[in-house]
């Protein structure tokens, strides 16, 4: 099991990258002046206490920014949020911190990220550009839930 976060670059199948704008992650077309965030991911060390068939449970952070992706309810709807948190603190916790965990599932070159706290909800971007990342239950419709990962360094 890795004990250091792995830096990755993420883009969707429409070649849009993740950019931080006013503490919100948005997906925009890759252009010269766009500087995508580098995502850090690390596997949960308590993998044996989580469901085994949904993917690899991981924490997702923004490299060097002390911000991590998490899921929380807003009303009755789960939402995707960025929270100030050290990814290694999450990694070292005595239990899986489910609100910050995602099942990372790979099929060929495509990756999906399903919320551990809210099973059936996936990180997604709207088919239109320049939209914030969201959580959705609607797979392959108006939202894109498939992403490509490129390992860095």
């Amino acid at each position: 099991k890795s004990e250091m976060p792995q830096p990755v670059s993420i883009q969707d199948i429409n070649h849009r990258v993740w950019v931080l704008q006013d503490q919100i992650l948005i997906a925009v077309p890759r252009k010269d002046r766009v500087s995508p965030v580098t995502i850090s991911l690390i596997s949960c060390r308590h993998v044996e206490t989580l469901e085994k068939d949904r993917g690899n449970p991981i924490y997702l952070g923004l490299n060097g920014l002390n911000l991590c992706l998490m899921c929380a309810k807003a009303g009755d709807q789960p939402t995707l949020q960025l929270k100030e948190k050290d990814i290694m603190d999450l990694y070292n916790q005595p239990e899986p911190v489910k609100s910050f965990l995602f099942y990372h599932s790979q099929s060929g070159r495509n990756s999906t990220f399903e919320s551990v706290a809210f099973p059936g909800w996936f990180i997604a971007v709207s088919s239109e550009g320049g939209c914030p990342l969201i959580l959705t239950q609607e797979l392959g419709k108006a939202n894109t839930t498939d992403f490509g990962l490129t390992m860095l360094f």
């Epitope: 206490t49 916790q93 005595p94 239990e95 489910k98």
Partner: antibody, heavy 121, light 109 residues
């Protein structure tokens, strides 16, 4: 109001088994972890283990492996501790406690009132 | 298995500041031990006071604070009150299990 209500005192014979109950109200046990702790007379606390009621996965202190079984029923919001092959060493008060994440850390925040188990012939 | 040691008893006066400590037999207590502090009052009434070394859950009075002092975890009660008379247990995380201390009986006279 968050509460953990435990079953009443038990007097059982050596070699027998017993199942202790912890019923939660004011929250859904699927949203947290339930820990079990043992307190023997005039001694400190011992961590027995935990269950994640959302998926029934358990972890134990190795010294309670084989002695304790943890289960949960999410439909009744109840967690259970079963103790087998009882001896006088198992005479103690047993507590369930919620191990809950508050955004910065986990806490042993709410506790049951304890179940007194006496093992005697 | 690690042994966690606490003062067996301490006495303080109302309004005074008192510090309880928690030592590990394996060496210095660090933030990776995620020290928790729990209060026990008569009739088996337990309440969690501190988690993750220095975090207080909602509803716990601000006079309770957690920290690391030297190589130990510490619980400080700033301005002790008579209702703080209780037994205080610390618990330390050791990668795959929790170990509790023997408890400190605090008397507020």
């Amino acid at each position: 109001e968050v509460q953990l209500q435990q079953s009443g005192a038990e007097l059982v014979k050596p070699g027998a088994s017993v199942k202790l109950t912890c019923t939660a109200s004011g929250f859904n046990i699927k949203d947290t972890y339930i820990y079990w702790v043992k307190q023997r007379p005039a001694q400190g606390l011992e961590w027995i283990g935990r269950i994640d009621p959302a998926n029934a996965y358990t972890k134990f202190d190795p010294k309670f492996q084989g002695k304790a079984t943890l289960t949960a029923d999410t439909s009744s919001n109840t967690a259970y501790l079963q103790l087998s092959s009882l001896t006088s060493e198992d005479t103690a008060v047993y507590y369930c406690t919620r191990f809950h994440w508050y955004g910065s850390s986990f806490f042993f925040d709410y506790w049951g009132q304890g179940t007194t188990l006496t093992v005697s012939s | 298995q690690a042994v966690v040691t606490q003062e067996s008893a301490l006495t303080t006066s109302p309004g005074e500041t008192v510090t309880l400590t928690c030592r590990s037999s394996t060496g210095a207590v660090t933030t990776s031990n995620y020290a928790n502090w729990v209060q026990e009052k008569p009739d088996h009434l337990f309440t969690g006071l501190i988690g993750g070394t220095d975090n207080r859950p909602p509803g716990v009075p601000a006079r309770f604070s957690g920290s690391l002092i030297g190589d130990k975890a510490a619980l400080t009660i700033t301005g002790a009150q008579t209702e703080d008379e209780a037994i205080y247990f610390c618990a330390l995380w050791y990668s795959n299990l929790w170990v509790f201390g023997g408890g400190t009986k605090l008397t507020v006279l």
